[in-house]
């Protein structure tokens, strides 16, 4: 912390301007006016301060706002924001998504640093939802946001923000995601045409339940195998031969190069071999002929 | 085909909470999403919320705070608890398959249980 | 929340002639609307889905109309099974909400 010493006679700050590059660290504690700095802040950014400068202006402004700086002031730290912990952050209010904006500008380019999740995480318990214009932005700086969020803060997510979200930003999604994601997407594409409905249902559909993919199987989709293969497991075994042919429409053929791995091996191990032979593929492992299928999960539930 | 079958506790004293179970039977509970529904005395249907059989459920914001709903599969069971409960909180409670196979899309309801009377009272 | 409201409240009817029900909603819920039909002691059934498709097993005489907000269910012509209390429930968005029932009688 900086000691209090009077500021030397004629270095008075009237303004935040490039002279107080020359201030010494005590200078600028003395000699900058917190109120002023407060009204000024837009201009720091363009001053290069350096970083033991900007750690003495960030001391004045948490003497001036020890509750948590105002809005008015956080819109404009610019590169401060860097200075700040996920402490100070935590007492902030930010409500304006220009200002969520402007800081997510800061950081643009690297990793989520924990002031950065700080943010967001006041930011949309702030709003209550995460509604389409913010989940716009955080997937714009960070195409992963949606899927470090847990399930419960997926929850969270209203329908109409969906429109909102690209293929991309679920590709690291796991399935409890998608199982929360799956649903509203459904619920929000659900006036759109068959063709339009599956292009943007497609990327979602690590989380629908068979009955789902059976429908969908009856619209001439065309799944292409990448899709296919984030199915869910449990999902995909209860699909009949002639159900996968036509889900899958041409790309069924790409079945071959995957028939080791999950979901299309054990997908393969639950339909009688007869059946397989009928996609001309050469897949192998299905049931053989005159074999009897007891669902035992079925049976354990039934009795 | 496929049933649903109600049951739990009929009479629930006010402040404690209700614990309701739903049995699938005659098919597998993890090819839909199973909804709770509601219809106090006399009047109109309300919707509680709903569960997926990986246990992602969603609910009605009315009843959020109050309300977990919660699934068995080796049971092939979903069940619901709603705490705190008042006079207000007395209805027939029903369970319900949410749509599968004739649309893709779409949040209504095709299969129904009977129902079964809650009756919240000291 | 949406908020269905159905009219009329009760709705007299002879066998034989033509009921219709009417259902709107507080907001546009495009085309996804269900109708039930519900006798005492019985679990709700679904008629209609989609405004104006019918459930498997319905029969003919029952008919679903209309978009955005305003639906008509029409009984063409009343067989003495059909007298129950009608429900009309949106599913454009969550929560799911029901209309508060139109109870069909015999005139």
């Known amino acids: 912390e900086v000691e209090k010493t009077a500021c030397p006679s004629g270095k008075k700050a009237r303004e935040i301007d490039e002279s107080l590059i020359f201030y010494k660290k005590w200078e600028l504690e003395a000699c900058v006016d917190a109120a002023l700095l407060a009204t000024q802040m837009d201009r720091v950014n363009a001053i290069p301060f350096t970083y033991e400068q900007l750690d003495v202006l960030k001391h004045k402004l948490d003497e001036l706002y020890p509750q948590g700086y105002p809005e008015s002031v956080i819109q404009h730290l610019g590169y401060l924001f860097l200075k700040m912990s996920p402490e100070d952050i935590r007492k902030w209010n930010v409500t304006s998504l220009e200002t969520l904006k402007a800081l997510l500008e800061v950081n643009k380019g690297h990793e989520m640093s924990p002031q950065v999740a700080t943010l967001i995480d006041r930011f949309v318990k702030g709003r209550g939802q995460l509604d389409k214009d913010t989940l716009d932005t955080l997937t714009a700086f960070y195409p992963g946001y949606l899927c470090s969020l847990s399930p419960e803060e997926l929850s969270s997510v209203p329908p109409s923000s969906i429109w909102a979200v690209r293929p991309q930003d679920l590709d690291t999604c796991d399935p409890r995601q998608l199982d929360v994601l799956y649903p509203k997407a459904r619920l929000a594409f659900q006036n759109m045409n068959g063709s339009e409905y599956f292009v943007k249902i497609q990327s979602f559909l690590g989380g629908a339940p068979t009955e789902d993919l059976k429908a969908l199987s009856q619209q001439n989709v065309s799944m292409d195998l990448a899709t296919f293969m984030k199915l869910r497991t449990d999902a995909v075994l209860p699909l009949t031969v002639a159900e996968v042919q036509k889900l899958l429409g041409p790309h069924v053929e790409g079945l071959k190069a995957e028939e080791r791995h999950r979901p299309v091996r054990d997908w393969i191990l639950r339909q009688r071999q007869d059946d397989l032979d009928t996609l001309g593929l050469g897949l192998q492992g299905g049931i053989p002929n005159g074999y009897l299928v007891l669902d035992l999960s079925m049976q354990e539930a039934l009795s | 085909q496929v049933q649903l079958q109600e049951s739990g506790p009929g009479l629930v004293k006010p402040s404690e909470t209700l614990s309701l179970t739903c049995t699938v039977s005659g098919g597998s509970i993890n090819n839909y999403y199973w909804s709770w529904v509601r219809q106090p005395p006399g009047k109109g249907l309300e919707w509680i919320g709903y569960i997926f059989y990986s246990g992602s459920t969603n609910s009605n914001p009315s009843l959020k705070s109050r309300v977990i709903i919660s699934v068995d599969t080796s049971k092939n069971q979903f069940s619901l608890k709603l705490s705190s409960v008042t006079a207000a909180d007395t209805a027939v409670y029903y369970c319900?398959?949410?749509?599968?196979?004739?649309?893709?899309?779409?949040?209504?309801?095709?299969?129904w249980g009977r129902g079964t009377l809650v009756t919240v009272s000291s | 929340e949406i908020v269905m409201t159905q009219s009329p409240a009760t709705l007299s009817v002879s066998p034989g002639e033509r009921a219709t029900l009417s259902c709107r909603a507080s907001?546009?819920?495009?085309?996804?609307l269900a109708w039930y039909q519900q006798k005492p002691g019985q679990a709700p059934r679904l008629l209609i889905y989609?405004?104006?498709t019918r459930a498997t097993g319905i029969p003919a005489r029952f008919s679903g109309s209309g978009s955005g907000t305003e639906f008509t269910l029409t009984i063409s012509s009343l067989q003495s099974e059909d007298f129950a209390v009608y429900y009309c429930?949106?599913?454009?968005?969550?929560?799911?909400?029901f209309g508060q029932g139109t109870r069909l009688e015999i005139k």
């Open positions: 429930q949106q599913y454009n968005n969550w929560p799911l909400t």
């Open positions: 989609g405004a104006s």
């Open positions: 907001q546009s819920v495009n085309s996804n």
């Open positions: 319900a398959r949410e749509v599968g196979r004739i649309a893709v899309a779409g949040w209504f309801f095709d299969l």
